[in-house]
C-alpha cells in the first residue's frame, strides 16, 4: 500500500438489526494533482462490488447511483475533502453483513481502494431491551414518574419512537414520542397492582422494536390472609372452620407447624400471638410464611393463636383455636364423708374404712382432652350414676354392710382407657350374741358371740372382776377365738358361785362397745336370766 | 486457493450424536469478517441452513433445530466441528460446509459435502 | 420463517433456448436473493448474489432481476451444461431459507 494513503476505522462493527450505527473514520492522501478548489469524493463498496461497475453503498458524488439495498438507508456523513470517511448505517438489516471499503477520488492521481482496511459489519438479533426506572412500591393516588431509557444512541441517528402501554394507563394510552429517552407521569389506583406497564421502542423498519414490561407494586394493606397448618412434617392444610374461628385438633406430643401468609405492599409484618402473648414475629423482608413451631405439642398449648399482619397501611387477623387432645391423665378419685366438705384424693388400690350408716361421696377426678367418659362399677356391675350429667360422681346417703367391696371408677376414651380401684370397708359397732350359760359337770359354762368391724374384742367381767385369762387356783378359764368380722369367747367357771353375782360379756371395737349380763340364781336347775347393756 | 472438506460418519444410529468437522484452508477464521456455516441437503430435497460461527467466535443457528446443534471452531487447527444431538432417520442428508463471500450471508465456496445416513 | 417458492418445480427446454426460472418469497426481502446452480452428485455453485449481480466467472447468459417478492433467473440461451438443479436463496432475516428448487431439463 502506497504510504501516503491511510485509514482509520475500526476492523468490526456490530448492531443490532434494525437499529443505527455510527462509524468513525479518518483518512488521509497525498497532495498530488489537485487544489483547494478540486471536488473530493468518497465512496463506501461492498466488498463483493467491483468499483467500476458496481454501485457503492453510499457516496458524497451526487451523480453516482448507490445500491439499491442500502438508498436512503447508508450515508457518507464525513467530508471525505477533511479526510472524514464516517458513514451512518440506519435500519441494519442481516443482508447488510458484509466487509466494506472506503474509496477516495480527488483530481486525476488520487483514486484509492482501500481494500484491505475496511470493516466488517455484523448485524445481530435484536435483543438488547430498553431500561425502566420506577419506584419500588408505588402509592396509590400519588402521582409517579417512570422513565424508560434505550441505551443505544449515535451522532446522525435518528431518535426511536417510545411507546407506553398497561391497564394503569388511560384507555388510550400514551401519545409516542421520539427521543432517547420517554418520561411518562401517571397516578396508580389501588387495582394497579400486580399489572404490566410497559415501554415500546419501535426503530424505522417495521417490525424492528423493543420493549420491557415491569409490574407494577401499588401500595396496600395486607389481605388474604391464610393460616395453615402443617402436622408431623407432612404438608400444609388449611384448617377447617368451625364458626367464625378455624378450629384444629392436634394430639398430644405431635409436632405442628402454623404458617400464616398475607398479601400486602409493602411486605406485613407477620407476628403469632396465643391469648396475648408474641410467641413470634418476622420483619417484612424476612421469610415467608412465618411458621410456628410446636415440636411435641403439650395440654397447656391449647388456646387462641393469632397471626396478625401489619404494614403502614393497615393490618388484618386471623384466629385459631388449637384444642390438644390427650387421654385420662393423673385418675383419682376425691372422698368426701358423713357430710364432711373436705376431700382427700385417693389413688388406685387404696382401702377406704366407712361407718355404717354414713353418707359417702365418691368423685372421680382425671384431666383428658376431650372429656374422658367416666362411670363406676362394683363387683363388675356398672352402677347407675347418682348424677347423670356427672357421671364421675356416685353418692352412697347411707353405707350398708353390703356395699363393702372394691368401686372402680373407669376413663374411657379415643386415646386411651385407664381405671382407678379402691376398697371399701364398712365399719359398725359390735352386734353382742349371749351370754349364755349351761351348767355342766364341772361348773357353769357359758359363751358370748359379736360381729363388728374392725373385728370386736370381748372381755368377760363377773361383779366388779375382769376375767383375764386362766385363774391361779384355777377357778375360771377364758378361751378366746375369731373369724372375720366375728369374736367368740367361751368362760368355764369352776367352783362355787356366789349367789347374786352378775356375769357379764362386753364386746367393743373403735366404734363402741356393747355389754350382756347374767344374773345368777341359786337353783341350779333353774333358769339364768339375761340382761343386756350397751 | 480456498478450500472446504466435510468429515464425520457415514452411517449413524437413532438417538446417537452426530459430530461432523469441516478442515479448511486458503483462508484464517481468525481474521475479521470470516465466518462458517453448514448447510444441510435431504436427497432429492432442498438446502436447509443449520448454523453459523465468526471468526469471534459469535454463533448463529436455525431456531428450529437450535436445542440440537452447537457449532465451535478450533482456529489453530482450521477447523470448525458442528454436533447434532438425538438423530433421527429424517436427519438422512449431504452435510455441506460453506463459506460467505467477504462475510456475506450468500455462499461463493462449499465443500464436496458428506452423506450422513441416520438407520437403525 | 420466511418461505422461498420455486416455480416450476420442472422446466422442459431446448438447448439454445431461453429459460425463465421465478421465485416468491413470503414476505418482503429487499434484494437479498441470491441463485444458485446444482448438479448431480456436486455442490451448489453461486451464480447471483444481491437479486441481480452476476458472481465472478458465471456466464453473461445468467441474468438475476426483482425486489420485493418476486425474482426471477434468466437463461437466454441455454447450453447443455446448464441442464441441473437451480435454487434460490433470501438473506434479507434470520434463517437463511432457500427454495424447493427447480429442474431444468433438457425437453
Known amino acids: 500500500m502506497d504510504g501516503r494513503f491511510w485509514i482509520r476505522v475500526q476492523e468490526s462493527v456490530m448492531v443490532p438489526e434494525g437499529l443505527c450505527i455510527s462509524v468513525p473514520c479518518s483518512f488521509s492522501y497525498p497532495r498530488q494533482d489537485w487544489t483547494g478548489s478540486t471536488p473530493a469524493y468518497g465512496y463506501w463498496f461492498k466488498a463483493v462490488t467491483e468499483t467500476t461497475k458496481g454501485a457503492p453503498v453510499a457516496t458524497n458524488h451526487q451523480s453516482r447511483e448507490v445500491e439499491m439495498s442500502t438508498r436512503g438507508r447508508f450515508q457518507l456523513t464525513g467530508d471525505p475533502a477533511k479526510g472524514n470517511c464516517s458513514l451512518v448505517i440506519r435500519d441494519a438489516q442481516m443482508q447488510d453483513e458484509s466487509q466494506y471499503f472506503f474509496r477516495v477520488e480527488r483530481g486525476s492521481y488520487v483514486r484509492y481502494n482501500f481494500m484491505n482496511d475496511g470493516f466488517f459489519l455484523k448485524v445481530t438479533a435484536l435483543t438488547q431491551k430498553p431500561d425502566v426506572y420506577i419506584p419500588e412500591t408505588l402509592e396509590p393516588g400519588q402521582p409517579v414518574t417512570v422513565i424508560c431509557v434505550f441505551n443505544w444512541a449515535f451522532e446522525e441517528c435518528p431518535p426511536p419512537s417510545f411507546s407506553w402501554t398497561g391497564a394503569a394507563l388511560s384507555s388510550q394510552g400514551t401519545k409516542p414520542t421520539t427521543s432517547h429517552f420517554s418520561v411518562l407521569s401517571f397516578t396508580p389506583r389501588p387495582q394497579d397492582h400486580n399489572t404490566d406497564l410497559t415501554c415500546h421502542v419501535d426503530f424505522s423498519r417495521k417490525g424492528v422494536s423493543a420493549q420491557r414490561t415491569v409490574r407494577l407494586r401499588v401500595a396496600y394493606a395486607p389481605r388474604d390472609l391464610v393460616i395453615s397448618i402443617s402436622r408431623d412434617n407432612t404438608p400444609a392444610l388449611e384448617p377447617q372452620p368451625q364458626g367464625n374461628v378455624p378450629y384444629l385438633e392436634a394430639q398430644k406430643g405431635q409436632f405442628l407447624r402454623l404458617l400464616c401468609a398475607a398479601d400486602s405492599q409493602p411486605p406485613a409484618t407477620l407476628s403469632w400471638v396465643l391469648q396475648n402473648r408474641v410467641l413470634s414475629s418476622s420483619h417484612p423482608w424476612g421469610p415467608r410464611p412465618l411458621g410456628l413451631e410446636l415440636p411435641g405439642v403439650k395440654a397447656g398449648d391449647s388456646g387462641r393463636y393469632t397471626c396478625r399482619a401489619e404494614n403502614r397501611l393497615g393490618s388484618q387477623q386471623r384466629a385459631l383455636d388449637l384444642s390438644v387432645q390427650y387421654p385420662p391423665e393423673n385418675l383419682r378419685v376425691m372422698v368426701s364423708q358423713a357430710n364432711r366438705t373436705v376431700l382427700e384424693n385417693l389413688g388406685n388400690g387404696t382401702s377406704l374404712p366407712v361407718l355404717e350408716g354414713q353418707s359417702l361421696c365418691l368423685v372421680c377426678v382425671t384431666h383428658s382432652s376431650p372429656p374422658a367418659r367416666l362411670s363406676w362399677t362394683q363387683r363388675g356391675q356398672v352402677l347407675s350414676p347418682s348424677q347423670p350429667s356427672d357421671p364421675g360422681v356416685l353418692e352412697l346417703p347411707r353405707v350398708q354392710v353390703e356395699h363393702e367391696g372394691e368401686f372402680t371408677c373407669h376413663a374411657r376414651h379415643p386415646l386411651g382407657s385407664q381405671h382407678v380401684s379402691l376398697s371399701l370397708s364398712v365399719h359398725y359397732s359390735p352386734k353382742l350374741l349371749g351370754p349364755s350359760c349351761s351348767w355342766e359337770a364341772e361348773g357353769l359354762h357359758c359363751s358370748c358371740s359379736s360381729q363388728a368391724s374392725p373385728a370386736p374384742s370381748l372381755r368377760w367381767w363377773l361383779g366388779e372382776e375382769l376375767l383375764e385369762g386362766n385363774s391361779s387356783q384355777d377357778s375360771f378359764e377364758v378361751t378366746p377365738s375369731s373369724a372375720g368380722p366375728w369374736a367368740n369367747s367361751s368362760l368355764s367357771l369352776h367352783g362355787g358361785l356366789s349367789s347374786g353375782l352378775r356375769l357379764r360379756c362386753e364386746a367393743w371395737n373403735v366404734h363402741g362397745a356393747q355389754s350382756g349380763s347374767i344374773l345368777q340364781l341359786p337353783d341350779k336347775k333353774g333358769l339364768i336370766s339375761t340382761a343386756f347393756s350397751n | 486457493q480456498v478450500t472446504l472438506k466435510e468429515s464425520g460418519p457415514a452411517l449413524v444410529k437413532p438417538t446417537q450424536t452426530l459430530t461432523l468437522t469441516c478442515t479448511f484452508s486458503?483462508?484464517?477464521?481468525?481474521?475479521?469478517?470470516?465466518?462458517l456455516s453448514w448447510i444441510r441437503q435431504p436427497p432429492g430435497k432442498a438446502l436447509e441452513w443449520l448454523a453459523h460461527i465468526y471468526w469471534d467466535d459469535d454463533k448463529r443457528y436455525n431456531p428450529s433445530l437450535k436445542s440440537r446443534l452447537t457449532i465451535s471452531k478450533d482456529t489453530s487447527k482450521n477447523q470448525v466441528v458442528l454436533t447434532m444431538t438425538n438423530m433421527d432417520p429424517v436427519d438422512t442428508a449431504t452435510y455441506y460446509c460453506?463459506?460467505?463471500?467477504?462475510?456475506?450471508?450468500?455462499?461463493?465456496?462449499w465443500g464436496a459435502g458428506t452423506t450422513v445416513t441416520v438407520s437403525s | 420463517d420466511i418461505v422461498m417458492t420455486q416455480s416450476p418445480a420442472t422446466l422442459s427446454v431446448s438447448p439454445g433456448e431461453r429459460a425463465t426460472l421465478s421465485c416468491k418469497a413470503s414476505?418482503?426481502?429487499?434484494?437479498?436473493v441470491a441463485w444458485y446452480q446444482q448438479k448431480p452428485g456436486q455442490a451448489p455453485r453461486l451464480l447471483i448474489y444481491?437479486?441481480?449481480n452476476r458472481y465472478t466467472g458465471v456466464p453473461a447468459r445468467f441474468s438475476g432481476s426483482g425486489s420485493g417478492t418476486e425474482f426471477t433467473l434468466t437463461i437466454s440461451s441455454l447450453q447443455s451444461e446448464d441442464f441441473a438443479v437451480y435454487f434460490c436463496?433470501?438473506?434479507?432475516?434470520?434463517?437463511?431459507?432457500f427454495g424447493g428448487g427447480t429442474k431444468v431439463e433438457i425437453k
Open positions: 436463496q433470501q438473506y434479507s432475516s434470520y434463517p437463511l431459507t
Open positions: 444481491s437479486a441481480s
Open positions: 486458503g483462508f484464517s477464521l481468525s481474521t475479521s469478517g470470516m465466518g
Open positions: 460453506v463459506r460467505g463471500l467477504y462475510g456475506n450471508w450468500f455462499f461463493d465456496v
Open positions: 414476505q418482503n426481502v429487499g434484494t437479498a
